[in-house]
Amino acid sequence: IFLSAFFTYVPMNEQIIIGRLGEDIILPSSFERGSEVVIHWKYQDSYNSYNVHSYYKGSGRLESQDTRYANRTSLFYNEIQNGNASLFFRRLSLLDEGIYTCYVGTAIQAITNKVVLKVGVFLTPMMKYEKRNTNSFLICNVLSVYPRPIITWKMDNTPISENNMQETGSLGPFSINSTLNITGSNSSYECTIENSLLKQTWTGRWTMKDGLHKMQSEHVSLSCELVNDYFSPNQDFKVTWSRMESGISSILAYYLSSSQNTTFYESRFSWNKELKNQSDFSMNLTDLSLSDSGEYLCNISSDEYTLLTIHTVHVEPSQETASDN
């Protein structure tokens, strides 16, 4: 038999595919069209090989499929005849990370494609401002991330290293808190969290504005602008105004860019519609009373950024009120 003269062997090709936890992915594999197609997708760890999906004699064969892949894999059966042996993989978990080999045999050749699957997760982080007794803290928090991210802090655009890191989740995904004590500081701070696998970066920026001194019954304008350096025009974001009182935050107003809806929780609170159209979310608080003294926090957040602006308002008694006493 002279078939071997027509037979070609193609060495193993390797591709890296990056997927997201809980999402679906396609592991690519193609071959030169031929008859008698046999496809075997296998997962290889340090000790063993596991059957992921097989196709031969014209149909999918799942008798020996490892249970962890049950109802999670399929081939593009209509495209096999066109040389497509790609595997559709549903609901990725971190345990799916690793090396997958796709063996394809036809009447004229056998090929083995190697796909390295890496799985990442990056739930949108948050920057929080907290007061504990007389201390002030900035917390950069990411609830679910994998692999371990790179977290950097800057003070007035200068990198700093002193921060307290807390991590949970021994194998991943990880939940990470990075806390910075900013008591008594008037500097601006920036925290960046980078997931190098997913090539995703999030930045939180905190700015303390100069204190505002106002008289009772007056109104105050609290500035908060969306900086174009941070936000692209079509990016969804939300704006939250809140007040910090005895370490507890209470929401005053809320704006969602996707729906353009604004909700006010304080009737004396408003913003200028013209300014809002120019991405300026400065607020007016009217008819000030002594109890309005405190810290006001503007939070503008998107998937990639959080901008926190703090205003300290001091409301002093008016002359009339003072002379009445």
């Epitope: 078939l3 031969y56 004699k57 045999g105 036809t106």
Partner: antibody, heavy 121, light 106 residues
Framework: QVQLVESGGGVVQPGRSLRLSCAAS????????MHWVRQAPGKGLEWVAI????????YYADSVKGRFTISRDNSKNTLYLQMNSLRAEDTAVYYC??????????????WGQGTLVTVSS | DIQMTQSPSTLSASVGDRVTITCRAS??????LAWYQQKPGKAPKLLIY???SLESGVPSRFSGSGSGTEFTLTISSLQPDDFATYYC????????FGQGTKLEIK
């Protein structure tokens, strides 16, 4: 071109063991399923066992199940058949044959020339 | 287990004849059937796979047909080199051979 060369045959007493080898060349051994097929003198062909390309699956004919073990060493391009508790009815020429593919198809595209095993007291 | 029955067991024919060998499966095997030719003292040689696909390098006078349980191997015009024993093999479930058909010179 594809070459399969069997060795290890000979005369053995009933109840004893024998190991057959098949040296493969001319193709990428680790890409193909391999079979053992036997033929008793003057009789027809009988399929004995198959091992898939990566050794993940092994199947046997009922007549040899529990007594014969098929294995392969892909680094040495060699197929093996360990035959234990041999019986007179195991006397045959043993062929090593290459599957068309991974072993999933189950027919024989290339054959060796065979090695004779005689079980006799 | 699937049984394969070949007929006839022996077939006498002359050079130039058209001959047909039949193979019957005890249950449906779809098209998963192969035909082999074996000469005395030699290893078998693959002729046909998937009931009707001609193996590369095999002369076109050999053809196969059938599906399910009934299959045939046809040699359209016998050549001197074709006198040998022919075996069918099902590979739907593991593997089973027919008992063989010896094609001899009349």
């Amino acid at each position: 071109q594809v070459q399969l060369v069997e060795s290890g045959g000979g005369v053995v007493q009933p109840g004893r063991s024998l190991r057959l080898s098949c040296a493969a060349s001319g193709f990428t051994f680790s890409d193909y399923g391999m079979h053992w097929v036997r033929q008793a003198p003057g009789k027809g062909l009988e399929w004995v066992a198959i091992i898939w390309y990566d050794g993940s699956n092994k199947y046997y004919a009922d007549s040899v199940k529990g007594r014969f073990t098929i294995s392969r060493d892909n680094s040495k391009n060699t197929l093996y058949l360990q035959m234990n508790s041999l019986r007179a009815e195991d006397t045959a020429v043993y062929y090593c044959a290459r599957d068309r593919s991974s072993g999933a198809l189950g027919y024989f595209q290339h054959w060796g020339q065979g090695t004779l095993v005689t079980v006799s007291s | 287990d699937i049984q394969m029955t070949q007929s006839p067991s022996t077939l006498s024919a002359s050079v130039g004849d058209r001959v047909t060998i039949t193979c019957r499966a005890s249950q449906s095997i779809s098209s998963w059937l192969a035909w082999y030719q074996q000469k005395p003292g030699k290893a078998p040689k693959l002729l046909i796979y998937k009931a009707s696909s001609l193996e590369s390098g095999v002369p076109s006078r050999f053809s196969g047909s059938g599906s399910g349980t009934e299959f045939t191997l046809t040699i359209s015009s016998l050549q001197p080199d074709d006198f040998a024993t022919y075996y069918c093999q099902q590979y739907n479930s593991y593997s089973t051979f027919g008992q063989g058909t010896k094609l001899e010179i009349k």
